[in-house]
Amino acid sequence: CKAMHVAQPAVVLASSRGIASFVCEYASPGKATEVRVTVLRQADSQVTEVCAATYMMGNELTFLDDSICTGTSSGNQVNLTIQGLRAMDTGLYICKVELMYPPPYYLGIGNGTQIYVIDPEPCPDSDF
């Protein structure tokens, strides 16, 4: 296994607007210029892909237009933001990093960030 160490925070609390941000940092053994980052969500022992992007070092991550993710890169760090989260989206979000170019190829998978999402309380009706 072409394992590479990936670090990410253990816990993140989403904002009241359903936005969660965390940093995914990888210890690159090579001199990669093009990197693929995938965010996976693990819940109830099922793993699903949330979003993915391949980026050139020093450039912004370009996710698909309809993606709920955005991100920026700086060196071996990727700053990921996931938006549109609701309480039901609470779960473990795993950062997967692949060094795609040039060879050698390396793969790293973080331990996951537990993102807690609390739906905001509806505003009470006002008599004023």
């Epitope: 053994p29 093009e34 693929r36 391949t54 050139m56 795609m100 170019y101 060879p103 050698p104 390396y106």
Partner: antibody, heavy 117, light 111 residues
Framework: EVQLVESGGGLVQPGGSLRLSCAAS????????IHWVRQAPGKGLEWIGI????????KYAQKFQGRVTISRDNSKNTLYLQLNSLRAEDTAVYYC??????????WGQGTLVTVSS | DIQLTQSPSSLSASVGDRVTITCRAS??????????LHWYQQKPGKAPKLLIY???SLESGVPSRFSGSGSGTDFTLTISSLQPEDFATYYC?????????FGQGTKVEIK
């Protein structure tokens, strides 16, 4: 199904040029580096070059330097090989191959190029 | 560039024989504990097929009679009991650095 399909082969005159295409399907083309490899009749596999996932970087084997150009159009899921100043020794089957997890995990079926007058 | 030298260039064997092919690199193809050396099988008129990746990992769907070993500069592909469908040409390739390079191939023929 993940596949690569080459096209554009055929008979070419010595001194001429060829442009081969490699159409990808079944995977996110823009995530992968792709290579061209060729095989002359009865000979071994020979690496021609590679293009990075974005298309921003290419690298060629020394013997093809200055005579070959690899390009890609990620919006069309297509890879190209342009080879100029063709000679009889360029007669070969040309393959495109995906560099998946550090190895060639998907190959095209190959397209035969014959250089002859 | 890393040169790969395979031996023998051809061999004749019978069904049931144990066959060993070696691949020697001009410099180490190891990096951070991984050997970036892979083995392919090719039959006439067909594209190469991956057998072994990272020197010793068996590709999914490949029979267990195929195995790979080695590290650094010296690698071996072994077919424990040759089957009729194994008569083909075998190539090693290094994917540590560009340019990628192939061995010259080993043709396994029927004795």
């Amino acid at each position: 199904e993940v596949q690569l399909v080459e096209s554009g082969g055929g008979l070419v005159q010595p001194g001429g040029s060829l442009r081969l295409s490699c159409a990808a399907s079944g995977f996110t083309f823009s995530d992968y580096a792709i290579h061209w490899v060729r095989q002359a009749p009865g000979k071994g596999l020979e690496w021609i070059g590679i293009i990075s996932p974005s298309g921003g970087s290419t690298k060629y084997a020394q013997k093809f330097q200055g005579r070959v150009t690899i390009s890609r159009d990620n919006s069309k899921n297509t890879l190209y090989l342009q080879l100029n100043s063709l000679r009889a020794e360029d007669t070969a089957v040309y393959y495109c191959a995906r560099l998946g997890y550090g190895y060639f995990d998907v190959w095209g079926q190959g397209t035969l190029v014959t250089v002859s007058s | 560039d890393i040169q790969l030298t395979q031996s023998p260039s051809s061999l004749s064997a019978s069904v049931g024989d144990r066959v060993t092919i070696t691949c020697r690199a001009s410099q180490s193809v190891d990096f951070y504990g991984i050997s970036f050396l892979h083995w392919y099988q090719q039959k006439p008129g067909k594209a190469p097929k991956l057998l072994i990746y990272d020197a010793s990992s068996l590709e999914s769907g490949v029979p267990s009679r195929f195995s790979g070993s080695g590290s650094g500069t010296d690698f071996t592909l072994t077919i424990s009991s040759l089957q009729p469908e194994d008569f083909a040409t075998y190539y090693c390739v290094q994917a540590l650095q560009l340019p990628l390079t192939f061995g010259q191939g080993t043709k396994v023929e029927i004795k």
